[in-house]
């Protein structure tokens, strides 16, 4: 016959915002100022992140959650928890090691971050260019050239649905 004893860790009763204080008979003590514990049963509280310099405080640290930072305007966050700040560019530009550079012809970027991407190739979908692309905007594809031939109806019926991998009959 086997006796089992359930030995519950007294620290498991300590809620978030406290720590299990070994120096005080494992009593649950509140996290000291500028520290937090986001889960129960912790034996230490974590030091709050300080958003210094160009890192601005987006959310203050509390006893149960860390501070959250963002970047001063002109830069944006990168990395887990905004570990880095990266400079913004204007629309129509991308960031390079030489700073912000205009998108090359045939590419665009409609955001302050990210890279220039190629304009959509309308002809791949059998369509024509309705509105030309710019450095800031993609092209707008319109009806196929055949639909715009003289005598063709100005209202084009939708193309029949087809399964992937099958050519239209």
């Amino acid at each position: 016959f086997e006796r089992t004893r359930s030995l519950q860790d007294p620290c498991s009763n300590c809620p978030a915002g406290t720590f299990c204080d070994n120096n005080r008979n494992q009593i649950c003590s509140p996290c000291p100022p500028n520290s937090f514990s986001s889960a129960g049963g912790q034996r230490t509280c974590d030091i709050c992140r300080q958003c210094k310099g160009v890192f601005r405080t987006r959310k203050e640290c509390s006893s149960t959650s860390n501070a959250e930072c963002d970047c001063t305007p002109g830069f944006h966050c990168l990395g887990a928890g905004c570990s880095m700040c990266e400079q913004d560019c204007k629309q129509g530009q991308e960031l390079t090691k030489k700073g912000c550079k205009d998108c090359c012809f045939g590419t665009f970027n409609d955001q302050k971050r990210g890279i220039c991407r190629p304009w959509t190739n309308c002809s791949l979908d059998g369509k024509s260019v309705l509105v030309n692309g710019t450095k800031e905007r993609d092209v707008v594809c319109g009806p196929s050239p055949a639909d715009l031939s003289p005598g063709a109806s100005s209202v084009t019926p939708p193309a029949p649905a087809r399964e992937p991998g099958h050519s239209p009959q």
Epitope: V54, M84, C85, K97
Partner: nanobody
Amino acid sequence: EVQLVESGGGLVQPGGSLRLSCAASGFNFSNYWMNWVRQAPGKELEWVANINQDGSEKYYVDSVKGRFTISRDNAKNSLFLQMNSLRADDTAVYYCARGGFGYGDSHYGMDVWGQGTTVTVSS
């Protein structure tokens, strides 16, 4: 502790010069690109210049080209910005920042920043 500490800021007359320094500690300085970034009063943060690990590549924002020179001394874990022909619109807090290139192909994030040094250009 990873740290960057700027110095050398101050009040200077238009047309004058200043040399900013940035002392790095707590990391292998020679492994990183380094940057100068500034924030003028009431303006957004603006990248000024960067320099690669061995100092062979240097790039500048258009507004400072020909006037500012970025350099580094890896033996002394130091970054510098020589600022000549200073103008009123150069007035700003100048930050030294680690990174800027070499983290990956798609971004130029700067992860370690100094506290900044203030440059005021006024007569």
